[in-house]
């Protein structure tokens, strides 16, 4: 696809999130870069409004699984890469994230190129959270598990849908589940690639910047598409 050509090198990324969870309003700004050749993302996020009212791990899917255009699609899967094909005009990404036995986030993002920079602008609205629950009570560990994001085409909307379950580790050794329902639709009216069913395999590492005084998260992520085998024509080349 034409959009794929925009991802041949390292691309700067800017992320802006405005959120409200149970009336706690906050903003997050992020900067970094992505390299789709390796499916690699390196970003630093700062809460620009003080202390983040929710644990950082609960925002990872919104902040970086938001820029799935940096996923590495192997050669035999490139025709299934909706995300890059929607660029540079970009896509709208909407999610409902339901935390088991707790509240839910609803998010809407616009992901697109502005000049040479890939920008992810997001609004997040969270409701029905327990004040002393795992999320508002900050009981999650500061780490992140590996996950698979399962993608299907949504021909009616000329986009895709994705479902996946995130497992957040809790300080007491248990797990907080977060069900994700995702929909992506192109912003432009050019042709996009509608994929066969497949998944993105994601690995994320969270860390801190020892010199940063503000509430922040440093994130390194690797994402690779999988789940579609080589066709017979590939095997006999």
């Amino acid at each position: 696809s034409k959009g794929e050509e925009l991802f041949t090198g390292v691309v700067p990324i800017l992320v802006e999130l405005d959120g409200d969870v149970n009336g706690h309003k906050f903003s997050v700004s992020g900067e970094g870069e992505g390299d789709a050749t390796y499916g690699k993302l390196t970003l630093k996020f700062i809460c620009t409004t003080g202390k983040l009212p929710v644990p950082w791990p609960t925002l990872v899917t919104t902040l970086t699984y938001g820029v799935q255009c940096f996923s590495r699609y192997p050669d035999h899967m490139k025709r299934h890469d909706f995300f890059k094909s929607a660029m540079p005009e970009g896509y709208v990404q909407e999610r409902t994230i339901s935390f088991k036995d707790d509240g839910n986030y609803k998010t809407r993002a616009e992901v697109k190129f502005e000049g040479d920079t890939l920008v992810n602008r997001i609004e997040l609205k969270g409701i029905d959270f327990k004040e002393d629950g795992n999320i508002l009570g900050h009981k999650l560990e500061y780490n992140y598990n590996s996950h698979n994001v399962y993608i299907t085409a949504d021909k009616q909307k000329n986009g895709i849908k994705a479902n996946f379950k995130i497992r957040h580790n809790i300080e007491d050794g248990s797990v907080q589940l977060a069900d994700h329902y995702q929909q992506n639709t192109p912003i432009g009216d050019g042709p996009v690639l509608l994929p066969d069913n497949h998944y993105l395999s994601t690995q994320s590492a969270l860390s801190k910047d020892p010199n940063e005084k503000r509430d922040h998260m440093v994130l390194l992520e690797f994402v690779t598409a999988a789940g579609i085998t080589h066709g017979m024509d590939e095997l006999y080349k």
């Epitope: 802006e16 405005d18 903003s27 609803k106 809407r108 616009e110 602008r121 609004e123 609205k125």
Partner: nanobody
């Protein structure tokens, strides 16, 4: 051509009420968050109130909480600002704004919008 047209401004006394209206020529009005902003002479434009696309979330600046009420009529493509107990410090040009981001948070926190109206003058004399 998208237009936001404000009306309802005027000159009133301290303690009086006014109702501002903003008519939007947006085909998908019900998917836009809407907001009211104001700008007093020599000051920056500030957010007064915002309302989500579905009308289920509203945000107010602390200075107007309890006095101003924002509402919308998606059938009429119109957003309203009911202003009660007006004070001289409410004197400003009031602008209507529309944002594709549906919860009104981007409007409120970044003061960024897709469309702006031309404004309507509100003057509160003591």
């Amino acid at each position: 051509q998208v237009q936001l047209v404000e009306s309802g401004g005027g000159l009133v006394q301290t303690g009086d009420s006014l109702r501002l209206s903003c008519a939007a020529s947006l085909r998908t009005f019900k998917s836009y968050a809407m907001g009211w902003f104001r700008q007093a002479p020599g000051k920056e434009r500030e957010a007064v109130a915002t309302i989500s696309a579905e009308g289920d979330s509203t945000y107010y600046d602390d200075s107007v909480k309890g006095r101003f009420t924002i509402s919308r009529d998606n059938a009429a493509n119109t957003v309203y600002l009911q202003m009660n107990s007006l004070k001289p410090e409410d004197t400003a040009v009031y602008y209507c704004a529309a944002s594709r981001f549906p919860y009104g948070l981007r409007l409120l926190q970044r003061r960024e919008s897709d469309y702006w109206g031309q404004g309507t003058q509100v003057t509160v004399s003591s």
